[in-house]
Interface confidence: low
């Protein structure tokens, strides 16, 4: 399932986009998974949709399940799933660890903390930021546009970061709050061109005809927090996402950091059902960042069904 | 795209680009250049924060910008040397649909404009 998990506060504003891509000419229409019934596009709505957004405004815990998002198109039709759930707002100030965004890292060099998911929303500046549920003051403290940056970083510094803003649709304002830990790193790190650690290059992979298969990607790209770094997967030269072949989807892994440091993305591409023709597409692993890109091509073979002996 | 067209070297163009407000939205936008018969490259990119990114070769020479309220991509070109001539295309994307990513790479991208013609004569 290409499906994506999505979680808010009850009463505050939750905008989830639908986990398929697609032209902004393709409809989207949307239904609540459990019951098949459909979404209502008027903004009078409480939960509506708009296109590739499903808004909750604002969301209550009933709200929580899971939502089908199609893209239509002339000639195919994308499904997307997505989790949403809805919490009771905390009485006290702990932040429980299934409402907590991506860590992110930080050094005295670069210390940006992202609020996450404000994209989705319609927000003016300023942010407000609070660490450890207190308001965030003092001059070492700086809310840029949807970051903020700490000046002088200490490891002090670390802690659970939330940012509060409010969003506007229609006139109506909604406040939104999410949180993220920041850590703080000593090491100076450094970027490098993208190292491909899986597949080899020009790998022969073994797959069983109707059986499914996944093929990773893994690429290292430097010491320390990479803040421009990507894996993915084409098809023929062509986006997963544009390939449209729903039986093939790209699936992101883990960020890894190993003891030496270095800073690793991993792209997992998953085929369902292998059939015949897959043995005839080239699989090409991407590796990217600011330095170039690095491509290892895969091609999958048939696997001979082993033979029992008795 | 518009605003392209034929300039002497060492001259300045601002080529712009009016998108949709789907395509706007997209996290990332940027420009592109392809060259006869080359491969198209990026050549700068901006978040939706504003954040900007540029290709090495360029030298500070480019600044890629955005008018949030005309729904408007700008790249403007100083100091051009003949060997920027090339067609400019503009194009939005979500990054990699990873969290924060905006650089000048075709991948990077969903949706591309027509494209506009840049020629720099020595």
């Known amino acids: 399932k290409f499906s994506k998990q999505s979680w808010g506060l009850e009463n505050e504003a939750l905008i989830v986009r639908c986990p398929r891509q697609g032209k902004p000419s393709y409809t989207v229409d949307w239904y609540y998974s459990q019951t098949n019934k459909s979404i209502p596009t008027q903004e009078r709505n409480r939960v509506f949709a708009s296109g590739q957004l499903l808004k909750f405004l604002p969301a209550a815990v009933a709200d929580s399940g899971i939502y089908t998002c199609i893209v239509r198109s002339p000639t195919f039709n994308r499904t997307g799933y997505a989790n949403v759930t809805i919490y009771k707002k905390q009485s006290d100030c702990n932040v429980p660890d299934y409402l907590m965004y991506s860590t992110v890292s930080g050094s005295e060099k670069n210390s940006k903390i992202y609020c996450p998911t404000i994209d989705l929303y319609n927000w003016t500046a300023p942010l407000e930021w609070f660490k450890n549920c207190q308001a965030l003051q003092g001059s070492r403290y700086r809310a840029h546009k949807s970051f903020l940056v700490i000046d002088n970083v200490m490891t002090e510094d670390a802690g659970d970061y939330t940012c509060k803003f409010i969003h506007n649709e229609n006139g109506a304002n909604y406040s939104v709050t999410a949180t993220r830990s920041f850590t703080v790193k000593d090491e100076q790190g450094f970027s490098l061109f993208p190292v491909i650690g899986a597949p080899a290059q020009n790998e022969i992979k073994e797959v069983e005809i109707g059986k499914n298969a996944n093929l990773t990607c893994s690429a290292c790209f430097g010491k320390g927090t990479q803040f421009l770094a990507a894996v993915l997967w084409q098809l023929n030269g062509t986006k997963i996402t544009d390939f449209g072949e729903p039986r093939i989807q790209q699936e992101e892994g883990q960020n890894q950091s190993f003891s030496n440091g270095l800073a690793c993305l991993d792209m997992v591409l998953r085929i369902a059902d292998v059939k015949e023709e897959d043995l005839l597409l080239q699989y090409d692993c991407l590796a990217l960042n600011l330095h170039g890109l690095r491509r290892h091509t895969v091609r999958l073979s048939r696997k001979n069904p082993s033979k029992e002996c008795f | 795209e518009s605003g392209g067209g034929s300039v002497q070297a060492g001259g300045s163009l601002r080529v712009s680009c009016a998108a949709s407000?789907?395509?706007?939205?997209?996290?990332?936008m940027g420009w592109f250049r392809q060259a006869p018969g080359k491969e198209r490259e990026g050549v700068a990119s901006i978040d939706s924060r504003g954040s900007t990114t540029y290709a090495d070769s360029l030298k500070g020479r480019f600044t890629i910008s955005k008018d949030n309220a005309k729904n408007t991509l700008y790249l403007q070109m100083n100091n051009l040397k003949p060997e920027d001539t090339a067609k400019y295309y503009c194009?939005?994307?979500?990054?990699?649909?990873?969290?924060?990513?905006?650089?000048?790479?075709?991948?990077?991208?969903?949706?591309w404009g027509e494209g506009t013609q840049v020629t720099v004569s020595s």
């Open positions: 194009a939005a994307g979500d990054g990699y649909g990873l969290e924060h990513i905006c650089i000048p790479h075709y991948y990077a991208m969903n949706y």
């Open positions: 407000g789907y395509t706007y939205s997209s996290y990332c």
